[in-house]
């Protein structure tokens, strides 16, 4: 089949790297400079990504493969293959529409990217507050306020057994 | 094909101004939100100053009420008037066009311009 598809369509022998230049009888040229062609049997070569401002050049494009990008310090990417840069901001702040501001009071962030988080609300777990939470750090929930009681067991009761007969509420 | 060309930087004193232009040619400038960022020697790029295609502004807290933005639909152009200079904005300026509309990102298919210099010492 692959003699038969060559026959047929000479433009299926040119390999990676090259195109199929209809101007010069169907022969394979190379790719032109600042362009790539990833596999075989290509009409044309695709233009070369251009790492340009905040994106900064990771893998530069050969005749066989495009450019890749990062983000120059001070931004990180997102998006599939760093489509898009994002501004750092520090710990304890968020980006916004007026740039990089503090996280308000009640919330966190511990990373330079993303967004202020709420403290963890430990009363929820029935535990209380054993750090206090900063712009840049969570609170740390410690034992229930009944645990840290005078005389408090730490060790757990049993269960009361049920009585035949009762199905568990 | 799409050209940012900026202009106007220079050398000038603490306290004084300078105004910056970005020509743009090759796409559809009155439709476009535009911007500036900087990166000073041996540090990190930092976003400046945006303008939506409707002429709204936002700014780094940095140059609020030093620097201002604003755009000639007419001309092409986006420029950048900075007063009360000091020495903590010497950098390089660069304009480029900012199609996510997020500020301080950035998108691969945005344009950029090869930066103008600004000093800003005694």
């Known amino acids: 089949f692959e003699r038969t598809r060559s026959l047929q369509d000479p433009c299926s022998n040119c390999p990676a790297g090259t195109f199929c230049d209809n101007n010069r009888n169907q022969i394979c040229s190379p790719c032109p400079p600042n362009s790539f062609s990833s596999a075989g049997g290509q009409r044309t070569c695709d233009i070369c990504r251009q790492c340009k401002g905040v994106f900064r050049t990771r893998k530069e494009c050969s005749s066989t493969s495009n450019a890749e990008c990062d983000c120059t310090p001070g931004f990180h990417c997102l998006g599939a293959g760093c489509s898009m840069c994002e501004q750092d901001c520090k710990q304890g702040q968020e980006l916004t529409k007026k740039g990089c501001k503090d996280c308000c009071f009640g919330t966190f962030n511990d990373q330079k990217r993303g967004i202020c988080r709420p403290w963890t609300n430990c009363s929820l777990d029935g535990k209380s507050v054993l750090v206090n939470g900063t712009k840049e750090r969570d609170v740390v929930c410690g034992p229930s306020p009944a645990d840290l009681s005078p005389g408090a067991s730490s060790v757990t009761p049993p269960a009361p057994a049920r009585e035949p007969g009762h199905s568990p509420q | 094909e799409v050209d940012l060309v900026e202009s106007g930087g220079g050398l000038v004193q603490p306290g004084g101004s300078l105004r910056l232009s970005c020509a743009v040619s090759g796409f559809t400038f009155s439709n476009s939100a535009m911007s500036w960022a900087r990166q000073a020697p041996g540090k990190e790029f930092e976003w400046v100053s945006s303008?939506?295609?409707?002429?709204?502004?936002y700014y780094v807290d940095s140059v609020k009420g030093r620097f201002t933005i604003s755009r000639d639909n007419a001309k092409n152009t986006v420029y950048l008037q900075m007063s009360s200079l000091k020495p903590e904005d010497t950098a390089v300026y660069y304009c480029?066009?900012?199609?996510?509309?997020?500020?301080?990102?950035?998108?691969?298919?945005?344009?950029w311009g090869q930066g103008t210099q600004v000093t800003v010492s005694s």
């Open positions: 480029a066009t900012w199609k996510t509309l997020r500020v301080g990102v950035w998108d691969e298919s945005d344009y």
């Open positions: 303008i939506y295609s409707d002429g709204k502004t």
